[in-house]
């Protein structure tokens, strides 16, 4: 058993049929010694008396808010949550496996640049009695500070018969060094509580591996005289790290016909312009990627050929 | 060339070679063999390799003030990785394919380190750590980890040389 926060405790249980459970001793936070009784949740049934209460925690029915009283007055509370371990593996019932980039991916994170700011998100089908708390650091043995905001509900989607809820959080490394080569990964820890179930999820990454630039901006076409060719130009996204002579991007320019089946023409360039042939009803798209490190491509920025 | 005394390197040549190194490091990575040994290792091999850190002067301001600190750190790293790529980790079982980009990568690391430091000048280099793989699967794991860490190192070096070529070239 360990303390999650003041008066909230997590009991770790091996979860299998007829498991013996864990013996837990609760102590009433009071100078009083006599006449103390204990109840669980809203029930008025007295579970025991005395300054301490010993219980055998085996299932969710044994978890909840234990209260000690004296003469009708509440002295203190202890909320017990359960953390299930099945066959040596902690349960992951609350969050949905996003399966990208690999199985058992519950948290996904992205950064728009090297400033040390990043966003993480996760999915669940649970709509009520759900709380999240997020902590982060750079490294784990001698952790350096990363400050995270509160997790917020950022999207709701209908998936078949189910509703899916997306939560996200923004974090910022306290003393980021954008030009350095990271040697210690960022660790993100999410505590999830649904009713009386506690779970924790972690992700470990380097900012360089979660970089996804915003799409290029100001995408423009300039027809070339007496030619089907056009000059496409664009600019670095505002959110990208500066100076651009140091934090350089590379670009992919694509000409795509109306039909998805039509052959795509692609050009790769380090410049912020390219010359391509504009076909009727086609569109021109440009996306960006770090020039020297193959993290994610940005989403496409597009303009119609016409 | 970056002479320890302080003359400028051939920024443009260094830029071209470091960008080639980036391409090679990424093309070598998936080709060292099939790999799903999860890299969730609690101990990182990369703790043992030289990193371009915050105080090494490799940021744009640091390069403007005095690029020598940064160039020395890059040189140290290039020599270190060149030695690793020539070690038993990459030459032992399982054998790399004859046309593996690791050979080109090895040669290019040496080429860039020589551009930075002509013969007769010596910057301090770091000892390569004893990672002591005894099994082929351990070598394979180390190859992946070393190449991942090399990708990060050469990305920073390439940024340095690109910025130097754009802003510090005579």
């Amino acid at each position: 058993i360990w303390e999650l926060k003041k008066d909230v405790y997590v009991v770790e249980l091996d979860w299998y049929p007829d498991a013996p459970g864990e013996m837990v001793v609760l102590t009433c936070d009071t100078p009083e010694e006599d006449g103390i009784t204990w109840t669980l949740d809203q029930s008025s049934e007295v579970l025991g008396s005395g300054k301490t209460l010993t219980i055998q925690v085996k299932e969710f029915g044994d978890a909840g808010q234990y209260t000690c009283h004296k003469g009708g007055e509440v002295l203190s509370h202890s909320l017990l949550l359960l953390h299930k371990k099945e066959d040596g593996i902690w349960s992951t019932d609350i969050l949905k496996d996003q399966k990208e980039p690999k199985n058992k991916t519950f948290l996904r994170c992205e950064a728009k640049n090297y400033s040390g700011r990043f966003t993480c998100w996760w999915l669940t089908t649970i709509s009520t009695d759900l709380t999240f708390s997020v902590k982060s650091s750079r490294g784990s043995s001698d952790p350096q500070g990363v400050t995270c905001g509160a997790a917020t509900l950022s999207a709701e989607r209908v998936r078949g018969d189910n509703k899916e809820y997306e939560y996200s959080v923004e974090c910022q490394e306290d003393s980021a060094c954008p030009a350095a080569e990271e040697s210690l990964p960022i660790e993100v820890m999410v505590d999830a509580v649904h009713k009386l179930k506690y779970e924790n999820y972690t992700s470990s990454f380097f900012i360089r591996d979660i970089i996804k630039p915003d799409p290029p901006k100001n995408l423009q076409l300039k027809p070339l005289k007496n030619s089907r060719q056009v000059e496409v130009s664009w600019e670095y996204p505002d959110t990208w790290s500066t100076p651009h002579s140091y934090f350089s991007l590379t670009f992919c320019v694509q000409v795509q016909g109306k039909s998805k089946r039509e052959k795509k023409d692609r050009v790769f360039t380090d410049k912020t312009s390219a010359t391509v042939i504009c076909r009727k009803n086609a569109s021109i798209s440009v996306r960006a990627q770090d020039r020297y490190y193959s993290s994610s491509w940005s989403e496409w920025a597009s303009v119609p050929c016409s | 060339r970056a002479v320890p005394g302080g003359s400028s390197p051939a920024w443009t040549q260094c830029q071209q070679l470091s960008q080639k190194l980036c391409t090679l490091a990424w093309s070598a990575h998936p080709l060292v063999g099939h790999m799903d040994l999860r890299e969730e290792g609690d101990e990182e091999t990369t703790n043992d390799v030289p990193h371009i850190q915050c105080g090494d002067g490799c940021d744009p301001q640091g390069l403007r003030d005095n690029s020598q600190f940064c160039l020395q750190r890059i040189h140290q790293g290039l020599i270190f990785y060149e030695k690793l790529l020539g070690s038993d980790i990459f030459t032992g079982e399982p054998s790399l394919l004859p046309d593996s980009p690791v050979g080109q990568l090895h040669a290019s690391l040496l080429g860039l380190s020589q551009l930075l430091q002509p013969e007769g000048h010596h910057w301090e280099t770091q000892q390569i750590p004893s990672l002591s793989p005894s099994q082929p699967w351990q070598r394979l794991l180390l190859r992946f980890k070393i190449l991942r860490s090399l990708q990060a190192f050469v990305a920073v070096a390439a940024r340095v040389f690109a910025h130097g070529a754009a802003t510090l070239s005579p």
Partner: antibody, heavy 121, light 111 residues
């Protein structure tokens, strides 16, 4: 289908040399390592040695001086030679494929049926 | 050599009940966070069969009532609900250092 089949003498006299052949199919010896493992009657398993994809070998130091493992990749055959046999070498000898280096980390994913060798005069 | 010690030597469990086998290595069998610990099942007259590789990965075709956990020196094989066909001897094996070594085996029977 991946198969490994051991063949060789059933009975060997003390001091003689044992030669066992492992013939494999369904994969190439240039892609997978092969180990030899033995199991005395009613006892646990003992690893004898391995021949790697590139032809290098490693042996159990306890019996290294008596062992040789070689292979002919084109014939899909691996040969175990063990000199100076003794009654304590009586065991079932298995030829075993080591799983893909990058996934299995030394786990042996396919085993032959084994051949029982008795050492007796 | 790395010595692998299995416990218990034998285990009698009722059908549908849980069986747990432990394996302790005399030194760590982890290499940069990868556990080179594997579990095999051997039925009478048959060669061993790989069940779990790298401590916790289920070999394809093996029922998911089998699971493995642990790291460094302490490992566990669990059969969550014993079936009649699970009666066998179970071995752990390390491949972190030469020579590869096996545990002495745990015989699982039905109570």
């Amino acid at each position: 289908e991946v198969t490994l089949k051991e063949s060789g003498p059933v009975l060997v006299k003390p001091t003689e040399t044992l030669t066992l052949t492992c013939t494999v199919s369904g994969f190439s010896l240039s892609s997978y390592a092969i180990s030899w493992i033995r199991q005395p009657p009613g006892k646990a398993l003992e690893w004898l040695g391995v021949i790697w994809t590139g032809g290098g070998t490693n042996y159990n130091s306890g019996i290294k001086s008596r062992l040789t493992i070689s292979k002919d990749t084109s014939k899909s055959q691996v040969v175990l030679t063990m000199t100076n046999m003794d009654p304590v070498d009586t065991a079932t000898y298995y030829c075993v494929r080591e799983g893909d280096y990058g996934s299995y980390a030394g786990a042996m994913d396919y085993w032959g049926q084994g051949t029982t060798v008795t050492v007796s005069s | 050599d790395i010595v692998m010690t299995q416990s218990p030597d034998s285990l009698a469990v009722s059908l549908g009940e849980r069986a747990t086998i432990n394996c302790r290595a005399s030194e760590s069998v982890d290499y940069y966070g990868i556990s080179s610990m594997h579990w095999f099942q051997q039925k009478p007259g048959q060669p061993p069969k790989l069940l779990i590789y790298r401590a916790s990965n289920l070999e394809s075709g093996v029922p998911d009532r089998f699971s493995g956990s642990g790291s460094r020196t302490d490992f566990t094989l669990t059969i969550s609900s014993l079936q009649a066909e699970d009666v066998a001897v179970y071995y752990c094996q390390q491949a972190n250092k030469d020579p590869y070594t096996f545990g002495g085996g745990t015989k699982v029977e039905i109570k």
